[in-house]
Interface confidence: low
């Protein structure tokens, strides 16, 4: 639900025509921080698919435990399952660590459906593909969860790789890349490719296919083509960015820029959607289906519920239009779009009533808690969370799904002004993030 | 160790206003929303409004709309609440509450201030 | 606004006792309830937060359950100590509310 009164929008955005384009103030790329070019050891240490999840490797404790861990940028708790749970095939065996430390103290954590709830301690963690590295981190035991694990999703736990401001209980538990930070020479960034595959991949085959890369403390240029465009993190507790213009192949959706941010977007690995505040939600259907009108399509697939398909191999990509997001740039009064296809947001699902057909569910999805950049955006892009310059790059994934006509975009600079009133300032409430 | 200290007791005319002090040591001050909660004699808790100690956005209960104002002063990790146009019906005690954003309580509270409004 | 209802408004109980107090919401409030206890004189204090997670010092003879708008705490052996009024809380919407309170008295 959403809390607190709404503030008065603006009228309009004060934007320049999308042809001027604004200068680079510099033919060079500032240098990024931390290691770059090639991370060999971490390309394609991600499984998984975005209905379910990318997830790592990685071990815990003395003998080392190993689990699969999903990846999550939404949230800031390292929690895994600590005891037998149907949809588990392993779980963390606190007992049989000797380096495990108990905090003696609990956690809960409940969402609009579902919860988890723990024992708070540390342990020692590494992520075998991943940095050279030991940290003693936080970790929640998850004792009891209701709708959290997910059946045949191959993960045991998770890995909240947001900011402290949002861990559970509260911001004095650590999360883990702040203590690999701090009790290593790790930079302070990672970055994320995610591999949609494009079509419904069957148990035995998310299990052998390659789902991604999280590239720890750096940059890997194998991952992406053309260049990094930088977003600010608007406030450090989700990961928070600032969208400043929608448009539905070409089209701008012409909302106060407020609303695309109300009451705030997100970059979130562990929303499989591009979730949208509801205003921008029905703005953004009715484009979609005006633009798709030559094939008509029951209401329960654009709510979610109902899967459409065509005969295999003849989906027709080319009716369904692009969606470009504007983001602030780093610039004053610059601002860059990431483009994403429908192959993008239309997200292949088995149905196995007709498994000669192509299968898909509508992937975008209405928000009363603001936008979230969810898988399905980031399937497009390789996206870097650039922490310790408080930025979010983005460029063109070198896996992402496209076909022979489209390609996602990421483009820039265009000149827009007043960015800073697109930010909408949340009303404070405690509970405006108490139902994520 | 964490606590918040409150100002000390007040006796108001009818019409007066009073503020509040409610001072936090032991943790970051802006970490944590400061709520107000109030509690006339013999009758149970009633929640005033909070504010958000780092942006100094606030929340009122309708009822105090117009009349409360919670400010807060970052540089000495206090909050106030000034409560205006009083009546003798305002007289309760008046209790400060720390509340972190994603936690579920008020988990320190204040010693409370008594104002009495009497003419 | 979200109303909250305690029952009993009252109730008399021996040392050793189980006790339980209810607290209904006017609308479905998932598990977003605290529990709070007060002595006469003194701050209320946390008991309990999102129905059933048992806030750090407090004794386990204490417990919360429920969800939706149906929640219930419960004093599994009654401590001299525990005589006192208990509020219930939802923190879900403002304006937080609390119930009316349930007073604990000696037998």
């Known amino acids: 639900t959403q809390h607190g009164i709404r503030l008065p929008l603006r009228s309009g955005l004060g934007g320049a025509p999308l042809g001027l384009r604004l200068p680079r103030e510099t033919d060079e790329e500032p240098e990024e921080p931390g290691r770059r070019g090639s991370f060999v050891e971490m390309v394609d240490n991600l499984r998984g698919k975005s209905g379910q999840g990318y997830y790592v490797e990685m071990t815990v404790g003395s003998p080392p435990q190993t689990l699969n861990i999903l990846v999550d940028t939404g949230s800031s708790n390292f929690a895994v399952g600590a005891a037998p749970h149907p949809f588990l095939h392993r779980y963390y065996q606190r007992q049989l660590s000797s380096t495990y430390r108990d905090l003696r103290k609990g956690v809960y954590v409940p969402y609009t459906q579902g919860k988890w709830e723990g024992e708070l301690g540390t342990d020692l963690v590494s992520i075998p593909h991943g940095p050279n590295v030991t940290v003693r981190a936080n970790i929640a035991a998850i004792t009891e969860s209701d709708k959290f694990f997910i059946n045949g999703s191959n993960w045991e736990g998770i890995l909240g790789l947001a900011y402290a401001e949002i861990a559970r209980p509260d911001d004095s538990l650590e999360p883990f890349f702040d203590s690999l930070v701090k009790q290593t020479h790790v930079p302070n960034l990672f970055s994320l490719q995610l591999c949609g595959a494009g079509f419904p991949l069957n148990q035995s085959e998310v299990l052998a296919s390659v789902g991604g890369s999280m590239i720890i403390g750096g940059i890997d240029h194998s991952l992406y083509t053309g260049s990094l465009w930088y977003t600010p993190i608007r406030r450090e507790w989700y990961y928070e960015v600032i969208i400043v213009r929608v448009e539905i192949n070409g089209q701008d959706l012409k909302m106060d820029c407020k609303e695309y941010n109300y009451d705030k977007s997100i970059v979130d690995s562990g929303t499989t959607n591009l979730r949208l505040p509801k205003k921008v939600f029905e703005a953004a259907v009715k484009s979609i289906k005006a633009a798709s009108s030559t094939e008509k399509f029951p209401d329960g697939f654009w709510l979610g519920e109902q899967l459409v398909c065509w005969q295999a191999g003849t989906t027709p990509w080319n009716i369904f239009p692009v969606i470009s997001l504007y983001l602030m740039g780093e610039v004053t009064n610059q601002s860059f779009r990431i483009t994403i296809l429908p192959q993008q947001y239309l997200r292949p699902v088995e149905d196995v009533a007709t498994s000669q057909d192509d299968c898909y569910k509508f992937a975008i999805s209405q928000s009363s808690t603001g936008t979230v950049m969810g898988a399905v955006i980031m399937e497009g892009f390789y996206v870097v969370f650039d922490r310790a310059r408080k930025r979010i790059g983005f460029a063109v994934s070198a896996c992402h799904v496209h076909d022979e006509f489209r390609t996602a975009a990421v483009e820039g600079p265009f000149v827009t002004l007043d960015m800073e009133d697109c930010g909408y300032n949340i009303p404070q409430t405690d509970e405006s993030t108490l139902m994520t | 160790q964490v606590q918040l200290v409150q100002s000390g007791a007040e006796v108001k005319k009818p019409g007066a206003s009073v503020k509040v002090s409610c001072k936090a040591s032991?943790?970051?001050?802006?970490?944590?929303?400061m709520h107000w909660v109030r509690q006339a004699p013999g009758q149970g808790l009633e929640w005033m409004g909070s504010?958000?100690?780092?942006?100094?956005?606030?929340n009122y209960a309708q009822k105090f709309q117009g009349r409360v104002t919670m400010t807060r002063d970052t540089s000495i990790s206090t909050a106030y609440m000034e409560l205006s146009r009083l009546r003798s019906d305002d007289t309760a005690v008046y209790y400060c509450?720390?509340?972190?954003?994603?936690?579920?309580?008020?988990?320190?509270w204040g010693q409370g201030t008594t104002v009495t409004v009497s003419s | 606004d979200i109303q909250m209802t305690q029952s009993p408004s009252s109730l008399s109980a021996s040392v050793g006792d189980r006790v339980t107090i209810t607290c209904r919401a006017s609308?479905?409030?998932?598990?977003?309830l605290n529990w709070y206890q007060q002595k006469p004189g003194k701050a209320p204090k946390l008991l309990i937060y999102?129905?059933?997670s048992l806030q750090s010092g407090v004794p386990s003879r204490f417990s919360g359950s429920g969800s939706g708008t149906d929640f219930t705490l419960t004093i599994s052996s009654l401590q001299p100590e525990d005589f006192a009024t208990y509020y219930c809380?939802?923190?879900?919407?403002?304006?937080?509310?609390f119930g009316g309170g349930t007073k604990v008295e000696i037998k």
């Open positions: 509450a720390r509340v972190r954003v994603r936690h579920y309580g008020m988990d320190v």
């Open positions: 032991g943790y970051t001050f802006t970490g944590y929303y």
């Open positions: 504010i958000n100690p780092n942006s100094g956005g606030t």
């Open positions: 609308q479905s409030i998932s598990s977003y």
């Open positions: 999102a129905a059933s």
């Open positions: 809380q939802q923190p879900l919407s403002h304006p937080r509310t």
